[in-house]
C-alpha cells in the first residue's frame, strides 16, 4: 500500500536535483579556481542535511548553517549587483562586466538558481511530487528559507556603492515583498554601505518617462535614507544598448544617454 504523501500547492523537487547540485558545484569550482578547496560531496551532504527528513514548513536558517559555512566565499564587497524581478538582464550584465557579482555568481547562488526542493518529515526521501508554495502553504519552506539566508548574507557583505537593477515594466518597480525589498534592503550595513544606486530598466522602446520618480522608487528612497544610506537612481531607457555599451564602452554611440 503506497504511503500517504502530503500534497503541497507548489511544484515538486526539480528532477535530477542531487545530480544537478553536485554537477553545478563541480562546474563552479572548475570555472572559479579560487574555490577549488571546496569538497563538492560535502557541499551536497550539507545541502541535503538542511531539508531531508524535516517537515518542509518548519525549515530554519539554522538548518542551512553547515552549507553556509562550506560555501563561504569572499566577493569584492564594492562590486555587488542586487536585482529584483529582472534576473536575466542582471546575469547578462555580470557576464560582460566580469568584476561585478550577483548572488547567482557566487557558489551557493549558482547551486540553487532556478531549482526547487523539499523533503518529508521523518523519511529520507526527496519529494518530487510537490513542495510548499510560499503564499498558499507556508513561508518557512526549504527554498524560501535558503534564498532568505543567502540573500541576507550577501547584502550584509556589501560595501561602498551597491547597485540594484529594478524592472521598470512592473506595476511595482520596487516591491516591499520581493527578496530585495524584504531581505536585502534591510540587511545593507549603513556603516559599510555609502550609496544604493538603483538602475530602473525600461521595457518599451518609446518609454521616455523618468521612472526614478515612480512612487515605489520614492518609497525605496525613503527606506534607504532612514537607514542612513544615500540613494541614487538612473533610468536605463535602452537595456540592449546598455549591454552593448558595457561590452564596447569606446563605441561612439555610448556617450549619449542609455
Amino acid at each position: 500500500v503506497p504511503r500517504w504523501r502530503q500534497q503541497w500547492s507548489g511544484p515538486g523537487t526539480t528532477k535530477r536535483f542531487p545530480e544537478t547540485v553536485l554537477a553545478r558545484c563541480v562546474k563552479y569550482t572548475e570555472i572559479h579556481p579560487e574555490m577549488r578547496h571546496v569538497d563538492c560531496q560535502s557541499v551536497w551532504d550539507a545541502f541535503k542535511g538542511a531539508f531531508i527528513s524535516k517537515h518542509p514548513c518548519n525549515i530554519t536558517e539554522e538548518d542551512y548553517q553547515p552549507l553556509m559555512k562550506l560555501g563561504t566565499q569572499t566577493v569584492p564587497c564594492n562590486k555587488i549587483l542586487l536585482w529584483s524581478r529582472i534576473k536575466d538582464l542582471a546575469h547578462q550584465f555580470t557576464q560582460v562586466q566580469r568584476d561585478m557579482f550577483t548572488l547567482e555568481d557566487t557558489l551557493l547562488g549558482y547551486l540553487a538558481d532556478d531549482l526547487t526542493w523539499c523533503g518529508e518529515f521523518n523519511t529520507s526521501k526527496i519529494n518530487y511530487q510537490s513542495c510548499p508554495d510560499w503564499r498558499k502553504d507556508c513561508s518557512n519552506n526549504p527554498v524560501s528559507v535558503f534564498w532568505k539566508t543567502v540573500s541576507r548574507r550577501f547584502a550584509e557583505a556589501a560595501c561602498d556603492v551597491v547597485h540594484v537593477m529594478l524592472n521598470g515594466s512592473r506595476s511595482k518597480i520596487f516591491d516591499k515583498n520581493s527578496t530585495f525589498g524584504s531581505v536585502e534592503v534591510h540587511n545593507l550595513q549603513p556603516e559599510k554601505v555609502q550609496t544604493l544606486e538603483a538602475w530602473v530598466i525600461h521595457g518599451g522602446r518609446e518609454d521616455s518617462r523618468d521612472l526614478c520618480q515612480d512612487p515605489t522608487i520614492k518609497e525605496l528612497e525613503s527606506i534607504i535614507s532612514k537607514r542612513n544610506i544615500q540613494f541614487s537612481c538612473k533610468n536605463i531607457y535602452r537595456p540592449d544598448k546598455f549591454l552593448q555599451c558595457v561590452k564596447n564602452p569606446e563605441d561612439s554611440s555610448c556617450t549619449s544617454e542609455i
Epitope: 535530477r16 545530480e19 544537478t20 554537477a23 553545478r24 563541480v26 562546474k27 569550482t29 572548475e30 570555472i31 579556481p33 577549488r36 546575469h91 557576464q95
Partner: antibody, heavy 120, light 107 residues
Framework: EVQLVQSGAEVKKPGATVKISCKVS????????MNWVQQHPGKGLEWMGW????????DVAEKFQGRVTITADTSTDTAYMELSSLRSEDTAVYYC?????????????WGQGTTVTVSS | DIQMTQSPSSLSASVGDRVTITCQAS??????VDWYQQKPGKAPKLLIY???QRYTGVPSRFSGSGSGTDFTFTISSLQPEDIATYYC?????????FGGGTKVEIK
Amino acid sequence: EVQLVQSGAEVKKPGATVKISCKVSGYTFTDSVMNWVQQHPGKGLEWMGWIDPEYGRTDVAEKFQGRVTITADTSTDTAYMELSSLRSEDTAVYYCARTGYNSGYGFPYWGQGTTVTVSS
Amino acid sequence: DIQMTQSPSSLSASVGDRVTITCQASQNVDSDVDWYQQKPGKAPKLLIYKASQRYTGVPSRFSGSGSGTDFTFTISSLQPEDIATYYCAQSNTHPRTFGGGTKVEIK
C-alpha cells in the same frame, strides 16, 4: 560511455568564419563545462575558452577575444566554437574537451579534433 | 598567464629505460598539474592529474610528482607503445596553460 564527436575538416579563405561543432553523448550535457583547445601543426596545445552549457556563460582567452564565440545548443547536446576573420595562423586542429568526476581538473574526454586550413 | 616550461623538448631512450620529463611553472600552482600523452593524428590522452594521481586505466609505469612550481613525469620502463609527445598543463589558474611538449622516441 562519454563521447565528444566533432564536425569534419574545413578549408577556408582568409577573412572567412568557421564554426565547428562538438556533439556529446553518454552524459547530461548541462552537467559539465565544455572547453576548446587549439593545436597548430606540429606544435603545442593552447586553451581557447569554455562554455557552461546550462547558462550559456563563456570565458575566452585574451588572445582569442573578439574573434571567438562559443555557444551551446542544449536541445541537441552540441557545443560550437566560431572563429572569425580567419588568417593563415589559424590553420590548426581544434579540440573540444571536458573534465571528469575522477580526474581533478584535467581533461579525460576529448573530441577527435577538427582540422581547419586557412588558405587563399 | 602562468608559463609552463617543459624539458627536454625531445629525448631518445631504449625500451626498458627510465624516462623523466620535468615541468616548471612560472608561479605556484599547488598540485594542479596534469600530464597528457598525444600520438600523431590523435587527441591528447590524460595520464596523470593533480600532479601524481594516475587516471583510470593508465598503466602503473606512468607516474608524476611535485607541487608548487616543480613537477616531474616518469615512465619507469619505456615500452614501444609509449612513443608519443607528452605535455604538462596547469589547471590552477585561468587561463589553463600547457607546456611545450616532449617528444619521446625509441633509440
